[in-house]
């Protein structure tokens, strides 16, 4: 026998169900067409006639296929915290979603019911952990040799930087200032003000021979097991 | 100008001013006539730590007191070659500025 | 030693066992000092170019790795002097054995 093609509405068989697109009528006890995205029931199906669908009206929407007598509405407009990342359409609702800076305290289905700040971290704090679309900012203390002076939710806690001399140390919310190229002061016999480093020679001059070896300028640096002085511990 | 005599030992003081001195290193340079200049070591005031060219381990030994900026070398078992003028200056890499310098004389 | 006129150029030499360039900050650890007679060494150049602020820039710091130069572009009678280099690259720390520059 040729495939029999049902035209809505139609009964269903017995124990069967109706098709993709497709719902049962209770009153009609019938299989009727579901209207599509943007569209919903203007007149619902009988025994002989099929469903009736029409288009949304403006700032309501359908977004799935439905047999719905109105179209749902819209959100409401986005608040100033927010931003519209998807506009009301006749298939779509509005989606608001927290702006830059802020973050989502209050979730719902699709977008951002309520928005929050992100926290600033103060100086001598940094961020910790970032924030998030859903979670807020995690500050924490600068630790020794590192430094954040400014209110930042974004900022991490930076090290110092490092001085051949220093004339201010840093701290959790300084970063250490550095004498060099500062002007020199007069000095006592055995006092010492603000260094500052040259090296002299002309042709090849030996260095005293070290028993560790490091580089040597003609007659310039031992190398031993210290590490490269430029990174050397202390400030 | 320290006159010393052989065997005996001599401490060297260094006051600084000027910047921070328990934040940054302190160095010392011995210096004899016509034999350049030579690195003794340093020290980091704020905790101690020392870095000596293996040459003056044993002859040198370098100290701090953070309370009166002051950086101290003293010299053992002097001998003749121990003459010279040393110098204190602070520096993690080059010497910015350099104290005077304080001439040990060691003679019997 | 160099004996040199006033208004003369002159350039010195300094060299390397082992490269004084870090490759993290690309800087070659190597200082100049002036030493006038009587006086502590002055500190004129650092990172093997750069100059002391106050420094006349008749006195220029150059080369890397192993091989570098003090230029004094226009020797002026107050530049007499012992200068020395001196690596900064790792301790122990050590200098050149120095030029003397006499003023003819």
């Known amino acids: 026998l040729p495939a029999q093609v049902a035209f809505t509405p139609y009964a269903p068989e017995p124990g069967s169900t109706c098709r993709l697109r497709e719902y049962y009528d209770q009153t009609a006890q019938m299989c009727c067409s579901k209207c599509s995205p943007g569209q919903h029931a203007k007149v619902f199906c009988t025994k002989t006639s099929d469903t009736v669908c029409d288009s949304c009206e403006d700032s309501t929407y359908t977004q799935l296929w439905n047999w719905v007598p109105e179209c749902l509405s819209c959100g409401s407009r986005c608040s100033s915290d927010q931003v519209e990342t998807q506009a009301c359409t006749r298939e779509q609702n509005r989606i608001c979603t927290c702006r830059p800076g802020w973050y989502c305290a209050l979730s719902k289905q699709e977008g951002c019911r309520l928005c929050a700040p992100l926290r600033k971290c103060r100086p001598g704090f940094g961020v910790a952990r970032p924030g998030t679309e859903t979670s807020d900012v995690v500050c924490k203390p600068c630790a020794p040799g590192t430094f954040s002076n400014t209110t930042s939710s974004t900022d991490i806690c930076r090290p110092h930087q490092i001085c051949n001399v220093v004339a201010i140390p840093g701290n959790a919310s300084m970063d250490a200032v550095c004498t060099s190229t500062s002007p020199t002061r007069s000095m006592a016999p055995g006092a010492v003000h603000l260094p500052q480093p040259v090296s002299t020679r002309s042709q090849h001059t030996q260095p005293t021979p070290e028993p560790s070896t490091a580089p040597s300028t003609s007659f310039l640096l031992p190398m031993g097991p210290s590490p490269p002085a430029e990174g050397s511990t202390g400030d | 100008p320290e006159l010393v005599a052989p065997g005996a030992s001599v401490k060297i003081s260094c006051k600084a001013s000027?910047?921070?001195?328990?934040?940054?290193?302190m160095n010392w340079v011995k210096q004899r006539p016509g034999k350049g200049l030579e690195w003794i070591g340093r020290?980091?005031?704020?905790?101690?730590?020392?870095d000596y060219n293996g040459n003056f381990r044993g002859k040198a030994t370098l100290t701090a007191d953070t309370s009166s900026s002051s950086a101290y070398m003293q010299l053992s078992s002097l001998t003749s070659v121990d003459s010279a003028v040393y110098f204190c200056?602070?520096?993690?890499?080059?010497?910015?500025?350099w104290g005077q310098g304080t001439t040990v004389t060691v003679s019997s | 030693s160099l004996a040199m006129s006033v208004g003369q150029m002159v350039t010195m030499s300094c060299k390397s066992s082992?490269?004084?360039?870090?490759?993290?900050?690309?800087?070659?650890?190597l200082a100049w000092y002036q030493q006038t007679p009587g006086q502590s060494p002055k500190l004129l150049i650092y990172?093997?170019?750069t100059r002391l602020s106050g420094v006349p820039d008749r006195f220029i710091g150059s080369g890397s790795g192993t091989d570098f130069t003090l230029t004094i572009s226009s020797v002026q009678a107050e530049d007499l002097a012992d200068y020395f280099c001196?690596?900064?690259?790792?301790?122990?720390?050590?200098f050149g054995s120095g030029t003397k520059l006499e003023i003819e």
């Open positions: 200056a602070p520096g993690r890499w080059y010497l910015e500025v």
């Open positions: 000027g910047y921070a001195f328990s934040h940054s290193w």
């Open positions: 020290i980091h005031p704020g905790d101690g730590d020392t």
């Open positions: 082992q490269s004084l360039l870090t490759s993290s900050t690309q800087k070659n650890s």
């Open positions: 990172f093997a170019s």
């Open positions: 001196q690596q900064h690259y790792s301790t122990p720390f050590t």
